[in-house]
């Protein structure tokens, strides 16, 4: 049986259930490479608690469908009266990285996992020439989740004070320039991850071959090196590579950009001080708050619930988006489809469009920037599920009572952008981490 | 106050059985991971079983197909049924409760003799 997601195969990914202190191990082509939980095992579970292993999911008893891997085993479970077995079920979502798999729950004798990524979308475009895992557990299985800084198009320019050069990099995939072809970016080579610009020629000096990798807490490391055994003149006989180190910086603060820190013979060393080289647990909520000594903020945007039916309207050209965020209630252009965005057309207000749900809402705060998030909404033709991204800024003088209004500001591939404007995305720091 | 409390350990002959109970008081229950331990005279402690807060249940290779771990969150306890005992599950048998939020909670431990 051929392999569901071939460009999944190369790995083996992590998973955790954090309340109970377990680490699953996935392959979901072959087996994971763990001899306690036997030879065959394409889920390992791993309890930190009693230090014990079982596999719950055997990769030859394997079963897939476009959106579903279901992979049985021979353990029974204690479903009494029945024949029951352990079994894990993995459902796939078209997202716009290769993603990780999120542990869901588990019962007697299913564990669930979901999985956004690239690899189950129904049309190609968001697919990279090359891409690797982008997070990492801790030691206290915390997450680390670089998947927010990918470039779907473009690069980022790094810090260097070399006027004859510019070296761009993405974040655990190569630069896509046919999406977004800036004119220094045109040049480089296809696959590369690190491109380096000398006046009208791109070099490639460096591709994602292995995963993101945690050296200390707060300290994640990506490295690329070049494929191609053809060397490059002003390299003096070395082949290139790039080391890229992500450090969560001690406290709060704004964004910095990738410094260069070292560079010799083609080796380039990167320094990047980024909050989401921290534990998500630090930067992100599923409420409408972020606040404790774990987040060292005070946010609460639940303010901006609109109750009574009414909504925020945000006009987008051919579309009005009907907003209500940081609640459940229903829109009512949205009449059950538990739309936290409602998309309607203007030229037909027949045709409406969940482009995020209220239960699928995430709350993050990184590097100065306030945004929420609803996905999970209705299909486009790639088979993404629509989302939106609302990018909130601090203004204490906003109007509608200190509430102000979304902004729409664009579409990318079914991803709908707003700014807002409101007293409530003034961050109230501790200082404390 | 954060308690476990187990009970219904006893002496019974080689291939009887018997129910334990832990009963647990100041936690929400159902949040919890419950484990079950055990400990022979002049050995270490050693896992037996565990019941997550979702339901998914583990076993030692020691007990499996003859042990049961459950629980009733309406009492707040959980239960280990033992069948087919053997002369080497005589121990103390001790429940634990964990979470992310409370460091792990011990109980008292019950004594288990399997002899004839």
């Known amino acids: 049986q051929a392999a569901p997601f071939p460009e999944l195969c190369s790995y083996t990914w992590e998973a955790v259930d954090t309340k109970n202190n377990v680490l699953y191990k996935i392959n979901i082509c072959g087996s994971v490479d763990i001899v306690q939980c036997g030879p065959s095992s394409a889920v390992c579970m791993h309890d930190l608690k009693t230090r014990t292993y079982h596999s719950v999911g055997d990769s030859v008893l394997r079963s897939a469908t476009r959106s579903l891997l279901e992979f049985n085993t021979t353990v029974s479970c204690d479903q009494q009266g029945t024949n029951h077995r352990v079994q894990s079920s993995i459902a796939f979502l078209c997202g716009k990285t290769l993603g990780t798999p999120e542990f869901v729950t588990a019962t007697e004798c299913v564990h669930y996992f979901e999985w956004r990524t690239t690899a189950a979308c129904k049309k190609d475009i968001f697919k990279a020439n090359k891409e690797v895992p982008c997070y990492v557990f801790d030691e206290e299985l915390r997450k680390h989740d670089l998947n927010p800084l990918i470039k779907l198009s473009g690069a980022y320019l790094v810090d260097d004070s070399d006027p004859d050069t510019s070296l761009f990099i993405n974040v655990c995939r190569d630069i896509d320039t046919l999406r977004d072809p800036g004119s220094q970016l045109r040049a480089c080579p296809p696959g590369t991850a690190a491109c380096l610009v000398r006046g009208h020629q791109a070099f490639d000096v460096g591709q994602p071959r292995d995963g993101l990798k945690v050296v200390r807490k707060d300290r994640l490391v990506l490295s690329y090196v070049r494929e191609e055994a053809g060397k490059l003149d002003f390299c003096d006989g070395h082949s290139p590579a790039v080391t890229i180190t992500f450090v969560c910086p001690s406290e709060r603060r704004e964004g910095t950009i990738p410094k260069l820190t070292a560079k010799s013979n083609c080796r380039y060393e990167i320094e990047w001080i980024t909050e989401y080289a921290c534990h998500r647990d630090y930067l992100e909520s599923k409420t409408c708050s972020l606040s404790g000594e774990q987040q060292d903020v005070s946010i609460d945007l639940t303010p901006l619930a609109q109750s009574g039916g009414s909504s925020y309207i945000s006009d987008g050209k051919e579309y009005l988006f009907y907003l209500n965020v940081c609640g459940e209630t229903e829109i009512q252009f949205c009449n059950k489809k538990q739309a936290a965005v409602c998309q309607v057309k203007k030229s037909d207000t027949s045709q409406v469009k969940a482009a995020g749900r209220y239960h699928n809402q995430t709350l993050r705060y990184s590097d100065g920037d306030l945004t929420l998030i609803y996905f999970g909404g209705d299909e486009c033709s790639s088979g993404f599920q629509r989302m939106s991204v609302i990018n909130f800024r601090c203004n204490k003088t906003a109007g509608n009572d200190g509430k102000g209004t979304p902004v729409f500001t664009g579409e990318v591939d079914c991803t709908y952008f707003f700014t807002w404007d409101t007293e409530y995305a003034c961050v109230h720091h501790h200082h404390h981490h | 106050q954060v308690q476990l409390q187990e009970s219904g350990g006893g002496l019974v002959q080689p291939g009887g059985s018997l129910r334990l109970s832990c009963a647990a008081s100041?936690?929400?229950?159902?949040?919890?991971?419950m484990d079950w331990y055990r400990q022979a005279p002049g050995k270490q402690r050693e896992w037996v079983a565990t019941l997550a807060s979702y339901g998914w249940k583990t076993y030692a290779d020691s007990v499996k197909g003859r042990f049961t771990i459950s629980r009733d969150n309406t009492k707040n306890t959980v239960y280990l049924r033992m069948n087919s005992l053997k002369p080497e599950d005589t121990a103390v048998y001790y429940c634990?409760?964990?979470?992310?939020?409370?460091?792990?909670?011990w109980g008292q431990g019950t004594q288990v003799t399997v002899s004839s």
């Open positions: 634990k409760a964990s979470s992310p939020v409370l460091n792990d909670i």
């Open positions: 100041g936690i929400i229950f159902s949040d919890n991971r």
